[in-house]
């Protein structure tokens, strides 16, 4: 039951996560006009990935794309590329993990082949969200960069009589939405993969109990032929310790609800 | 479209006024507004922005902690409260539309304001 | 603040002539974001409010004769009239619509011979 838990909040926690990174790779505003300390324009300028716009105080707003690929700096093409492959590996790992989910039964998949898919998605997910965190701070980071670039050299112009002033970007909302989805698609991915250690079957069908004789190192199974060939009591098979004979307690699975669809 | 200003008048130095402006033919909440003024003789002078929402505001300096700006959507009019009025307060006073590029596309008549004892 | 200054501060012309008047900012009123240059032109006759003639430097206001044409960039701009006629007769203030405050020019006034 809690492996199912686990499972299904990661599935639902990378969900969100990755609606967000797609929803962050399309904002517009990764980077937004900085207003403070700046001359009061009657413009608001704001860039995204793909395009850059500017809002009048008419309410008029224009957005042009980028419809160069060479002429585009190296890092927004790699921030670009790093978004991309964040939502690519993110599809990928809910479609794997749709069908690894305990709850949903396809023909006669068996634990090993969920538990396999299930952690496949969980490291599918934790790439796509340091992919998106990743992208995310390079762009930051580039941001920064260019404040303070901007900053120290606010005006530009000849001899100081005509001057330019330089717009100064800060960070847009889609930073923060980009951070967060990309946190929480890295968090589904570590439930995903603390589910799969829940769902994957031991190696053996029975129960292992150890008989340790002094001065000999025999271990005795009991349950004979039955035991040895897997027919018998639907217990699992236990890790076999040293020193004296003991057994985990039994986790038995039983059919419920949640196992059908 | 159409903006017709009102409220303007002799007013003595110190004193108050209200002027409005009312706006019809368009969609007035969907736009902002200006108020610029001009002294008998002289050039135009900007005063005030609005923004159809009313916020945010802007103000020329000589007329900022003076001079309020605001406005009633519902009925489409625009306001221009004066306090503290001085001598080179002595202007006409228009509205104008808000439009692309941030330009003024239409004006009102203009109001006149003469601040004198 | 946005100074805006008008050269010359009048024009006496004759029917048919062509005219330029200019405008020099001190800042550039040029956006980077969608390069266009915020500046407007307007007309304004006597006992009349002023009229708008051309918006981002260049974008004739509909309904305004193509005789009109504005060009420029940065902080110098102009204004031309190619074939002037009779009700050009006014007076053209440009206006800085980049900064606030809003700025307007001392004005050129046009006047026939």
């Known amino acids: 039951m809690a492996v199912t838990a686990c499972q299904g909040l990661g599935f639902v926690v990378s969900l969100i996560g990755i609606a967000g990174i797609i929803a962050a790779t399309c904002m517009d505003q990764w980077s937004t006009q900085d207003l403070y300390n700046n001359p009061v324009t009657a413009v608001f300028n704001y860039q995204g990935l793909w395009r850059s716009c500017v809002r009048e105080s008419s309410g008029f707003t224009e957005c042009r794309g980028y419809f160069t690929l060479l002429g585009l700096p190296a890092m927004l093409q790699a921030v670009r590329a790093l978004m991309i492959v964040g939502i690519v590996l993110g599809a990928i790992g809910l479609l794997v993990s749709i069908f690894a989910l305990k709850c949903i039964r396809i023909g006669s998949m068996e634990d090993s082949a969920k538990a396999n898919m299930t952690l496949t998605s969980g490291i599918m997910f934790i790439v796509s969200g340091l992919c998106a965190i990743a992208g995310v701070s390079v762009f930051a980071n580039m941001l920064v960069t260019n404040f303070w670039m901007s900053t120290a050299n606010m005006y530009t112009g000849m001899g100081g009589m005509v001057q330019t002033v330089q717009t100064r970007y800060t960070f847009g909302a889609a930073l923060f939405v980009g951070w967060v989805a990309g946190g929480l698609t890295l968090i589904g991915g570590v439930m995903m993969c603390i589910a799969c250690r829940g769902l994957a079957p031991e190696e053996t069908n029975y129960k292992a109990v150890s008989y340790h004789a002094s001065g000999h190192s025999v271990a005795y199974k009991p349950g004979g032929f039955k035991a040895s060939t897997g027919f018998g009591s639907n217990t699992k098979n236990k890790k076999i310790y040293d020193g004296g004979a003991r057994t985990e307690d039994e986790v038995q699975s039983y059919p419920s609800k949640h196992d059908y669809v | 479209v159409q903006l017709q200003e009102s409220g303007g008048g002799l007013v003595q130095p110190g004193g108050s006024r209200k002027l409005s402006c009312a706006a019809s033919?368009?969609?007035?909440?969907?736009?902002?507004m200006h108020w610029v003024r001009q002294a008998p003789e002289k050039g135009l002078e900007w005063v005030a922005f609005?923004?159809?929402?009313?916020?945010?505001?802007y103000y020329a300096d000589t007329v900022k902690g003076r001079f309020t700006v605001s406005r009633d959507n519902p009925k489409n009019t625009l306001f221009l409260q004066m306090t503290s009025l001085r001598s080179e307060d002595t202007a006409m006073y228009f509205c104008?539309?808000?439009?692309?590029?941030?330009?003024?596309?239409?004006w009102g008549q203009g109001s006149s304001v003469t601040v004198s004892s | 603040d946005i100074m805006m200054t008008q050269s010359p501060l009048s024009l006496t012309v004759t029917a048919g002539e062509k005219v330029t008047m200019n405008c020099k900012s001190s800042?550039?009123?040029?956006?980077?974001?969608?390069?266009?240059?915020?500046l407007a032109w307007y007309q304004q006759k006597p006992g009349q409010p002023p009229k708008l003639l051309i918006y981002?430097?260049?974008t004739r206001e509909s309904g305004v004769p193509a005789r009109f044409t504005g060009s420029g960039s940065g902080t110098d701009f102009t204004l031309t009239i190619n074939t002037v006629q009779a009700e050009d007769l006014a007076v053209y203030y440009c206006?800085?619509?980049?900064?606030?405050?809003?700025?307007f020019g001392t004005g050129t006034k046009l006047e026939l011979k």
């Open positions: 981002w430097a260049s």
């Open positions: 800042q550039s009123l040029l956006n980077g974001g969608n390069q266009k240059n915020y």
């Open positions: 609005i923004s159809s929402g009313s916020s945010p505001i």
């Open positions: 033919g368009f969609s007035f909440s969907s736009f902002g």
């Open positions: 104008a539309r808000n439009y692309y590029g941030n330009a003024m596309d239409y």
């Open positions: 206006q800085n619509d980049y900064f606030y405050p809003l700025t």
